[in-house]
Interface confidence: low
């Protein structure tokens, strides 16, 4: 495939990055589903300033990104380092919280309304970021 | 446009109770943290409580732990103040706001607490 | 708990007049802090949020900045509808607390 040199419409571009940010909810792994479908993945955050950017486009709305620990350790979709990387969690999260009755514990983490992180349940409705890096070679087959 | 629109204040006696309500429209009421905040007449702001959507985390002021109960219908776009127990030091107007940073209020709603 | 200070307490100042008000944090809030206005009678008006990002329909004449312990309100050009009570909040951690607030008024 050929590099994507340009963000696909209706998508943002910042820092080399393209990210698309929905306006409805789906469970994560529906969420994740649909981002994998766009050749993209659930937004991984890296740093302070795309924490800024995120948040300045989402508002105050709960809403998905692409770290999960439903297997145990907390990873990044993208395989970007968890433990040295960004973090930008609330107060006392994540907690793993079991007292919602919905079975389980909280696997998926969720941007809140003031921006920083929470672990939820992974079935919850919320809206999603996804994003897709410029540089990457695109699945669509090169213009003859 | 969003608007909050307290209810259910009014005079009780120390040791009483009463249930503030907050009817929330203009928004997805059930995506977004709400709050209450209070104001004894002539002085400064003071959070009282703060319930996360889907009800998920919920946090009180020491000054009302053990008294006042916080609660959400997402369905009826409503927030609650249960407070029992009531004071002298709780008599303020108590407002509802939304999310962590306030950016919307409603009117506010009287609480007076005498013999 | 975090407490939070203003100053000056109050003020007095004239229309036109660029007036300042400061708040400070006891620890950290990275940029977790918000403004409100609130005139007798009435319920605080959000003015700004995540330190310097403008609410929505406030006056391009209001500005706020800082990050960490330190924060500013700035308005650029008093107006006589500006004349009012001003508080600060941090929302970075629970329990939410408020600044004392600073009082401008007319000279």
């Known amino acids: 495939g050929s590099e994507r040199t340009c963000c696909p419409v209706n998508w943002v571009e910042h820092e080399r990055s393209c990210y698309w940010f929905s306006r409805s909810g789906k469970a994560w792994a529906d969420a994740d589903n649909y981002c994998r479908l766009e050749d993209a993945h659930l937004v991984v955050v890296t740093s302070w300033e795309e924490q800024k950017f995120v948040q300045h486009h989402i508002g105050p709305v709960n809403t998905w990104m692409g770290l999960h620990d439903q297997n145990g350790p907390w990873k990044w979709v993208d395989g970007t380092d968890y433990e040295t990387g960004f973090k930008n969690w609330r107060p006392e999260q994540p907690d793993d919280w079991y007292g919602h009755g919905l079975g389980g514990g909280e696997d998926c983490a969720h941007f809140t309304d003031d921006g920083r992180w929470n672990d939820d349940v992974c079935q919850r409705p919320y809206r999603w970021v996804c994003e897709t890096e410029l540089d990457k070679a695109s699945q669509e087959p090169p213009l003859l | 446009e969003v608007q909050l629109v307290e209810s259910g204040g009014g005079l009780v006696k120390p040791g009483g109770s009463l249930r503030l309500s907050c009817a929330a429209s203009g928004f997805t009421f059930s995506s977004y943290t709400m709050n209450w905040v209070r104001q004894v007449p002539g002085k400064g702001l003071e959070w009282v409580s703060s319930i996360s959507g889907s009800s998920t985390y919920i946090y009180y002021a020491d000054s009302v732990k053990g008294r006042f109960t916080i609660s959400r219908d997402d369905a009826q776009n409503s927030l609650y103040l249960q407070m029992n127990s009531l004071r002298g030091e709780d008599t303020a107007v108590y407002y509802c706001a939304r999310v962590t940073s306030f950016d919307y209020w409603g009117q506010g709603a009287l609480v007076t607490v005498s013999s | 708990d975090i407490q939070m200070t203003q100053s000056p307490s109050s003020l007095s100042a004239s229309v036109g007049d660029r007036v300042t008000i400061t708040c400070r944090a006891s620890?950290?809030?990275?940029?977790?802090l918000a403004w409100f206005q609130q005139k007798p009678g009435k319920a605080p008006k959000s003015l700004i949020n995540?330190?310097?990002s403008l609410q929505s329909g406030v006056p391009s004449r209001f500005s706020g900045s800082g990050s960490g312990t330190d924060f500013t309100l700035a308005i650029s050009s008093l107006q006589p509808e500006d004349f009012a009570t001003y508080y600060c909040q941090q929302y970075y951690s629970y329990p939410f607390t408020f600044g004392p607030g600073t009082k401008v008024d007319i000279k």
């Open positions: 995540a330190a310097s």
């Open positions: 620890q950290g809030i990275n940029n977790y």
